[in-house]
Structures are given as structure tokens and as C-alpha cells.
Interface confidence: low
């Protein structure tokens, strides 16, 4: 999906009002310096691409993020403010329902959410001029 035509300011508002707090809640009890940011993005569409990937694509050691509160709100924000986004996600969502697993907060998931926090921060304060 190409995030170029999203309403970035509306997504930013959604992040500041709710998603950021849900990310903090998920990370509660974890030191902010515990994980180094190794994933970066250079402009807002790129940031959303990386955010989508880390939030919804299961990775080795962390398969459960898509059902977290911050993930559901992220998905809702993208569906509302990115034209055509929800249509591209139907197949992915159906595939996810088939492999639902018990929620386990692993260290790998904590690291991944720490990366997400960094990506969202960059999304909100982009160094790159918006095209």
C-alpha cells in the first residue's frame, strides 16, 4: 500500500490522543533505554509503511501485536485516513483470524513496540520535507 495520500495530520492527532498512550501502557515496566532503535524512516509515508509492517506482520518471537489495543487503533486510523487502505487489508485480516494465539508479551515483542514508538516519534517530527 502507498501511504502517500494519507491525511497525516489526522493520523498524527489519533496517535497523540490515544495510540501513544496505549504504546506506553504496553511498555510499562520497561526502561526507555533498554532497547536501541534500529528501524528508521525518512518521511511520513515511509514511516507509516514501517509502522504497518512492525504492527501487523508477525515476526519470529512476536506474533501477537495485531490484537493489541494500539494496533487496533492504528488500523482504524489508517483505514479512516488513508484512502483505499482498508480494502488492501481484508485478506491479511482473514488470514490472521485463522492463526489466533494466546497473548504472550515476549521480550521480542517489547523490543518491537519500542521500535514502533520510535517510528511514531519520527512520523510526528519528520526531518524530511513533506512532498
Amino acid at each position: 500500500y502507498d501511504f502517500t495520500n494519507c491525511d497525516f495530520e489526522k493520523i498524527k492527532a489519533a496517535y497523540l490522543s490515544t495510540i501513544s498512550k496505549d504504546l506506553i501502557t504496553y511498555m510499562s515496566g520497561t526502561k526507555s533505554t533498554e532497547f536501541n532503535n534500529t528501524v528508521s524512516c525518512s518521511n511520513r509515508p515511509h514511516c507509516l509503511t514501517e509502522i504497518q509492517s512492525l504492527t501487523f506482520n508477525p515476526t519470529a518471537g512476536c506474533a501477537s501485536l495485531a490484537k493489541e489495543m494500539f494496533a487496533m487503533k492504528t488500523k482504524a486510523a489508517l483505514a479512516i485516513w488513508c484512502p483505499g487502505y482498508s480494502e488492501t487489508q481484508i485478506n491479511a485480516t482473514q488470514a490472521m483470524k485463522k492463526r489466533r494465539k494466546r497473548k504472550v508479551t515476549t521480550n521480542k515483542c517489547l523490543e518491537q513496540v519500542s521500535q514502533l514508538q520510535g517510528l511514531w516519534r519520527r512520523f510526528n517530527r519528520p526531518l524530511l520535507k513533506q512532498q
Epitope: 528508521s40 525518512s42 515511509h46 520510535g118 516519534r121 517530527r125 519528520p126
Partner: antibody, heavy 119, light 107 residues
Framework: QVQLVQSGAEVKKPGASVKVSCKAS????????MHWVRQAPGQGLEWMGW????????NYGQKFQGRVTMTRDTSISTAYMELSRLRSDDTAVYYC????????????WGQGTMVTVSS | SYELTQSPSVSVSPGQTASITCSGD??????AFWYQQKPGQSPVLVIY???KRPSGIPERFSGSNSGNTATLTISGTQAMDEADYYC??????????FGGGTKLTVL
Amino acid sequence: QVQLVQSGAEVKKPGASVKVSCKASGYTFTGYYMHWVRQAPGQGLEWMGWINPNNGGTNYGQKFQGRVTMTRDTSISTAYMELSRLRSDDTAVYYCARGNWNDDAFDIWGQGTMVTVSS
Amino acid sequence: SYELTQSPSVSVSPGQTASITCSGDKLGDKFAFWYQQKPGQSPVLVIYQDSKRPSGIPERFSGSNSGNTATLTISGTQAMDEADYYCQAWDSSAGGVFGGGTKLTVL
């Protein structure tokens, strides 16, 4: 320890190009943006742009677009800044500075490279 | 283009408080950063994100930012604090923007 070591001073003629290098050590090179800032003699600091060593993405200040090229070689943890079509007012100390990705601060600076443009 | 304005010079007696200001349109909506530069040396970060102090920077350095003005405050100024100080902010269209610098003289 974390440090940035830049190449030595250069003297160039107007119209020529200069390429300054900045070798990073003591941290993960691809985990931080690398910025370039210059300072003309007796003047203030001027931001030129950045490169994301992770993917090679760049963003140049409007004043330098079309004349500056920032590249990197991740195998040797080195960033490069090339400025073309040099003019006398490009005479300055050129600094590389690590951009802390979490807060956008220039937290580590190179020692600077003096570039003199003179006919 | 976005501009940051600093007064060219500030003088202070040892032990007194020095205040260096930086003004820009709605600067309080952005993060302000402060760098110290001594003659012949590279700049050093002294304050980031308005008021945070990097490790190794003395507690006498503090910062604030609201409205159109960011302020760097040095309490109990020492001779070793004599230097040029630059404010900096990020602008979505202009990128990195520095103020013109303020020369702090400790009398």
C-alpha cells in the same frame, strides 16, 4: 568511545568539487542519521542536510540542493559530503554530526574539515 | 524560510545567571536545541528537546521554550562557560535551522 573523524583540510579552485569524509566508530553506524553542518569564518552554523545510513535516503537544505551529494559506505562506517561548483563563499569548516534518532539532537560532532576556495 | 533570532552578545559576571534567548515564529511548538562552541572547537550539545540535559553537562545549564521564545539559562556562570551559543530547531519546510549565535562573555 563514540567518535567521528573527518578527512583533512582541502584547498580548491572556484568551480571545482570537494568531497569530505566522516568515519564513525564506537556505535552502530546505520542506527543514526548523519548530518552535515558548515561554518564560514567568523560566522554561525548552517545546516546542509542529512543522510540516513540505513537506506541511503537523503534530505538536503534548499540552499544546497543541486550542488550537494551525501553518500555513505556502510562497510567502513563512513559518510561523505560532496559539494560541487565551489564558490569563494563556500570557504568554511564543514562538520559531520550524528543525529540522535530519538530526539533529533546533534549529539556527536566531528572535528571539522576546513575547505578553502580560492583562485 | 524559517528564521531563529538571537542577540549577538550577552555579558555576565562570574557566579551570576546568564540568560540567552532565541526567538522564532511559534518556536514553542517545536523542540529547541542549544549548542556551545568554544574558539577553535566543534560545537557541543548542552540542551536538547527544550530542557533536557545530556550526560556530562553541568546542572547549571537549563532550558525552556514557550510561545515564540526559547531560553538557555546558565546559573552560577563560570569563566569556562564563555563561548558562542547557538539555538537550533527543526522546521518541516526549511529542515535544520540555527540561530545566528550569541557570544557569552564572562566579565
